[in-house]
Interface confidence: medium
């Protein structure tokens, strides 16, 4: 009956319009489909033009939904990465705060003439944190070799102390242990508890970096075409009720997205690996524990040179031979009390155990997120048929959706009846991302282990590597020359959508 | 004895950048930081920048500061100070200084001075 | 910045103290004199009171909180010139140097 078919154009008449899209392209009534590309060819409300339209507008529509589901996962993981970096970096920055309130009075000039020492100690540690290129453990090694010499100084200034004695007390030093065990526990767990930290933190901007990079790949003509089919050929066929096929949905979306969920397994082994980490944030060698108390090993170590002084004196002569006198300098420094110590074990504030169980119940609920993501955008964006089998839109008209729902990831998608894929070209930036997955997730699963893995750059667009020692002012400049025998690689990214707020390295 | 020898002072253009090189002997040039002071003509002493021994930590004084990059080479015990854009007010004589200790940028610690060099902005 | 009195005078013999004020508090001091202008300064006193080898006696260093005394015991005619401190500030950690004070002995 051709007025009832001439009637249905004013429902498309309707939905075009209100895309935006010019009406005087729409016919008043249905005309034969032979030019149709994309739709079958049947009579249809549809001109060429209106075809290429909506299939513009389709394709639009799926990638904004795509960047949407996107954008919540990212938020969540930047929202992640910034409530644990402020979390560590506040640790580190109570600690030094705490040194800089307490230590003045507890061990007087042996601080306020080494201030530097430790304030660039806290830089080192904050650069470490942050992925910088540093060997937490020669920087170790060279902060206590050069405070001990300062130290050394300042407690016998009636010697006369030239370079080579001061080489042969740092030769000496290793088995005098001057220190005590300070520097040896510091070592072992700071190592251990920065690398957590940073690791867990780092895992959260490579996962946010991998969703950003992958949500800007642009879907193919082949993707384009099938859901035109899928969601306005129904409209240009006369039955604009219809509503897609669940099944129907499901085959098209998972051929679009085959490269995406080839991302399933090392997403699901990277957010294990990060889950798994947190472990490592609990107990005497746990993040808190240690990267909140590094002032008390620094006073431990303080004290403990004091208390060894007559000792050390006396090994250290034995070792290197009498020191001339110095005729200019006073008497040997008195010895001082010793410095009260905070105790070592922070009481957890509780902060950290409500941040690590939100962070491993969001990761556990976005493991199959790619996976997941045909079945989502079919049932929240594409407004899915709920009616029985034979009444939904299966791509050429309306009725039963007889075809298997394809597996997830491109091999599966060699039969796919909906979307032409060709299964011997994977899409590269998605490949480039599934390596990023594998290199974060070896890193985090050797962070578990407790060794300093060499951070390399993990970004294919890096941004300028970490730095910052809280300068209170710009007098300060980031030094990268490192006279250290270590040749490690910056880290380019090493917290992604972090802004650098604490000056540079050096002042 | 400790040597200080500084050289590429001279007269310069105002706008165009100046690179002074410190010489140091007599001494283990990697322990130590190492310090550029200056003086204008009837002026006091001024803080120019400073290194740490190892090279990863400088401090430059507010005059200079985004202008000037101070840097060390332990192989050939020299400390370079380049600065950029030129001023008249940069005009005066600079010093290299050694410190005592091997952190910046304490004016507090230092124990030797060169002899300077001057230099002179003017168009 | 440090503050210092811009001149003192003394008599040969006497004893001259010259102050160096506004630093911080627990940070150190040193001393340097110059005999003339251009000619290189000489450091008389490092972090307080550690005095140069080929630096006579008569000069010594005292801190009380945040100011530095360089007191000159039995003052000579040689001993005429400009003494500066330094010291640091103790938020950026860059040198800081006070104004300089004239030293002319009568």
């Known amino acids: 009956d051709p007025a009832s078919k001439s009637r249905s154009c004013g429902e498309v008449r309707q939905i075009y319009g209100a895309k935006g899209f010019s009406l005087s392209d729409v016919p008043q009534a249905e005309i034969s489909g032979e030019h149709l590309r994309i739709c079958p060819q049947g009579y249809t409300c549809c001109t060429s033009e209106m075809e290429e339209n909506l299939a513009n507008r389709s394709h639009a529509e799926l990638e904004t939904a795509l960047r949407d589901s996107s954008r919540v996962l990212q938020a969540m993981l930047a929202t992640q990465l910034r409530s644990f970096d402020d979390h560590f970096q506040h640790l580190l920055n109570d600690s030094e705060r705490t040194l800089q309130a307490t230590f003045p009075g507890a061990f007087g000039e042996l601080y306020t003439q080494n201030a530097r020492a430790f304030r660039d100690l806290y830089s080192e540690l904050r650069l470490y944190y942050r992925g910088a290129n540093l060997h937490l453990e020669e920087t170790l090694a060279e902060f206590w070799a050069r405070l001990l010499e300062r130290l050394f100084k300042q407690l016998h200034p009636q010697l006369l102390l030239p370079d080579d004695y001061l080489d042969c007390l740092g030769k000496q030093a290793e088995a005098l242990r001057p220190f005590g065990e300070a520097p040896r526990e510091l070592r072992l767990r700071a190592t251990r508890a920065f690398v957590a930290a940073r690791s867990f933190v780092q895992g959260l901007g490579v996962a946010s970096d991998v969703v950003r990079k992958v949500a800007q790949v642009p879907l193919g003509p082949e993707c384009s075409r099938a859901v035109m089919k899928l969601v306005y050929c129904a409209h240009c066929l006369g039955v604009p009720g219809a509503r897609p096929c669940p099944d129907y949905c499901r085959n098209v979306l998972k051929g679009c997205l085959a490269n995406q969920a080839d991302l399933d397994a090392e997403w699901r082994n990277l957010l294990d690996s990060m889950v798994l980490i947190t472990d490592k944030f609990w107990g005497t060698s746990g993040v808190e524990s240690v990267i909140g108390s590094v002032h008390t090993w620094l006073a431990e170590a303080i004290n403990a040179l004091q208390d060894n002084r007559d000792t050390l004196t006396a090994k250290v002569i034995q070792g290197c031979g009498n020191p001339k006198v110095n005729p200019q300098g006073p008497g040997p420094e008195e010895k001082r009390r010793r410095g009260k110590l905070a105790p070592r074990e922070r009481p957890p504030s509780g902060t950290l155990e409500k941040l690590v169980s939100e962070a491993k119940a969001q990761l556990r609920d976005v493991q199959d997120f790619w996976i997941s993501l045909p079945g989502t955008l079919c049932s929240e964006k594409m407004a899915l048929s709920t009616a029985s089998d034979d009444r939904c839109w299966n791509g050429m008209a309306r009725g039963r959706y007889l075809p298997e729902v394809m597996g997830d990831g491109l091999a599966n998608q060699i039969n796919n009846p909906e979307v032409e894929v060709d299964i011997t070209k994977p899409d590269m930036t998605i490949r480039q991302q599934i390596m990023q997955l594998k290199i974060m997730t070896n890193r985090l699963r050797s962070a578990y282990n407790g060794n300093d893995v060499d951070f390399q750059d993990a970004s294919d667009d890096g941004s300028g590597s970490g730095s910052g020692d809280g300068c209170l002012d710009d007098l300060c400049s980031r030094k990268v020359s490192r006279k250290s025998s270590s040749s490690r690689t910056p880290l380019t990214h090493a917290l992604p959508g972090l802004s650098e707020q604490e000056g540079q390295k050096t002042s | 004895a400790v040597t200080l020898d500084e050289s590429g002072g001279g007269l310069q253009t105002p706008g165009r950048a100046l690179s002074l090189v410190c010489k140091a002997s007599g001494f283990t040039f990697s322990r130590y930081a190492m310090y550029w002071v200056r003086q204008a003509p009837g002026k006091g002493l001024e803080f120019v920048a400073g290194i740490g021994n190892t090279g990863r930590y400088t401090g430059y004084g507010s005059a200079v500061k985004g202008r000037a990059t101070i840097s060390r080479d332990s192989g050939q015990s020299t400390v370079r100070l380049q600065l950029n854009n030129l001023r008249a007010e940069d005009t005066g004589n600079y010093y290299c200084?050694?410190?005592?200790?091997?952190?910046?940028?304490?004016?507090?610690?230092?124990?030797?001075w060169g002899h300077g060099t001057e230099v002179i902005v003017s168009s | 910045a440090s503050t210092q009195p811009s001149s003192v005078s003394a008599n040969p013999g006497e004893t001259v103290k010259i102050t160096c004020s506004g630093g911080?508090?627990?940070?150190?001091y040193g001393w340097y004199q110059q005999k003339s202008p251009g000619s290189a300064p000489v450091t008389l006193l490092?972090?307080?009171?550690n005095r140069p080898s080929d630096i006579p006696s008569r000069f010594s260093g005292s801190k009380s909180g945040s100011t530095a005394t360089l007191t000159i015991t039995g003052v000579q005619a040689e001993d005429e010139a400009v003494y500066f401190c330094g010291s640091v500030d103790s938020s950026s950690y860059a040198g800081i140097f006070g104004a300089g004070t004239t030293l002319t002995v009568l």
């Open positions: 200084a050694k410190s005592v200790s091997p952190y910046c940028c304490d004016a507090a610690d230092i124990d030797a």
């Open positions: 490092y972090s307080n009171n």
């Open positions: 911080s508090s627990g940070y150190a």
